[in-house]
């Protein structure tokens, strides 16, 4: 029961996490900036992984997509890649984990197969969560670096000159959504891996073999010789190749407490 609960909870937590990763990836508020040197109106800029937006106090809002691929910063491309990899792995993990759920019966799927699928999905969730956390952290680092550069390189310019606009770079809502979502996916993955341990049947490394004698008190000696006590018809030590040994697959036998450890 606890295993089913752990697996189910892991699935739900991962599902929420992956939904969050998708939401964060699509959001525009990865970076937000307030322009201070604007004497007209409060201008609020925010950027996402796919487009940049401007919002003014007058209510005007405009967004423009990054239509070029090659010209964009490598760091932005890396973040995009990490988030997409996280989403893809998470989606595959969800698909696998649905079939791995103990509460869902699909044909005659054994617990060992479900355990393997649970472990696979758990690992996928962990990697997915790590990808999201890494992506968001790389972007956050890029923002911090940009902020320090923009404040350090302030200089006024006239006559064809250029100056860095004094902006306050702040972490957008998407960063926090991404961090939390990545964390949830990671936790969900760990829970799935824990559930896997409970799902796996405790099997021995050897196949249980039951021995059946043709005579009354028959034992096996090393080397495959059958020793007779004299009560049976076989009074001589005769090598038996087709002896009474049968695996459980071949002969139906009554279970013994020694059959399973």
């Amino acid at each position: 029961m606890a295993v089913t609960a752990c697996q189910g909870l892991g699935f739900v937590v991962s599902l929420i996490g992956i939904a969050g990763i998708i939401a964060a990836t699509c959001m525009d508020q990865w970076s937000t900036q307030d322009l201070y040197n604007n004497p007209v109106t409060a201008v609020f800029n925010y950027q996402g992984l796919w487009r940049s937006c401007v919002r003014e106090s007058s209510g005007f809002t405009e967004c423009r997509g990054y239509f070029t691929l090659l010209g964009l910063p490598a760091m932005l491309q890396a973040v995009r890649a990490l988030m997409i990899v996280g989403i893809v792995l998470g989606a595959i993990g969800l698909l696998v984990s649905i079939f791995a759920l103990k509460c869902i019966r699909i044909g005659s799927m054994e617990d060992s197969a479900k355990a393997n699928m649970t472990l696979t999905s758990g690992i996928m969730f962990i990697v997915s969560g790590l990808c999201a956390i890494a992506g968001v952290s790389v972007f956050a680092n890029m923002l911090v670096t940009n902020f320090w550069m923009s404040t350090a390189n302030m200089y006024t310019g006239m006559g064809g000159m250029v100056q860095t606009v004094q902006t306050r770079y702040t972490f957008g809502a998407a960063l926090f959504v991404g961090w939390v979502a990545g964390g949830l996916t990671l936790i969900g993955g760990v829970m799935m891996c824990i559930a896997c341990r409970g799902l796996a049947p405790e099997e021995t490394n050897y196949k249980a073999v039951s021995y059946h004698a043709s005579g009354h008190s028959v034992a096996y000696k090393p080397g495959g010789f059958k020793a007779s006590t004299g009560f049976g018809s076989n009074t001589k030590n005769k090598k038996i190749y087709d002896g009474g040994a049968r695996t459980e697959d071949e002969v139906q036998s009554y279970p013994s407490k020694h059959d399973y450890v």
Partner: nanobody, 122 residues
Amino acid sequence: QVQLVESGGGLVQPGGSLRLSCAASGSIFMINVMGWYRQAPGKGLELVAVITRGASTNYADSVKGRFTISRDNSKNTLYLQMNSLRAEDTAVYYCNADLNLASDPFKWYTYWGQGTLVTVSS
């Protein structure tokens, strides 16, 4: 390389009109606030008028009612229509734009033009 090129300046009589233009070119991603500043001989830099992407405007008190700022976002061009010009409007007019580049849309820069001279004299 981003460039802001002003044009339309020249000699005009008091009460006359001029239309200044400023064209921004280069690998620009988005231009945010654009504005006109002027520097009269022997004086400091003075704000004339500014306009946001959403067409919110602000004018210096000395030009209100006489000057009109406008922009064409699709062409990355800024205009200043100057009417009822006075002798005190004589100055070098600079174009200014807050913009970000296609290569780094996360960083904003202020670019300045070389300036165009407007002389109001009879």
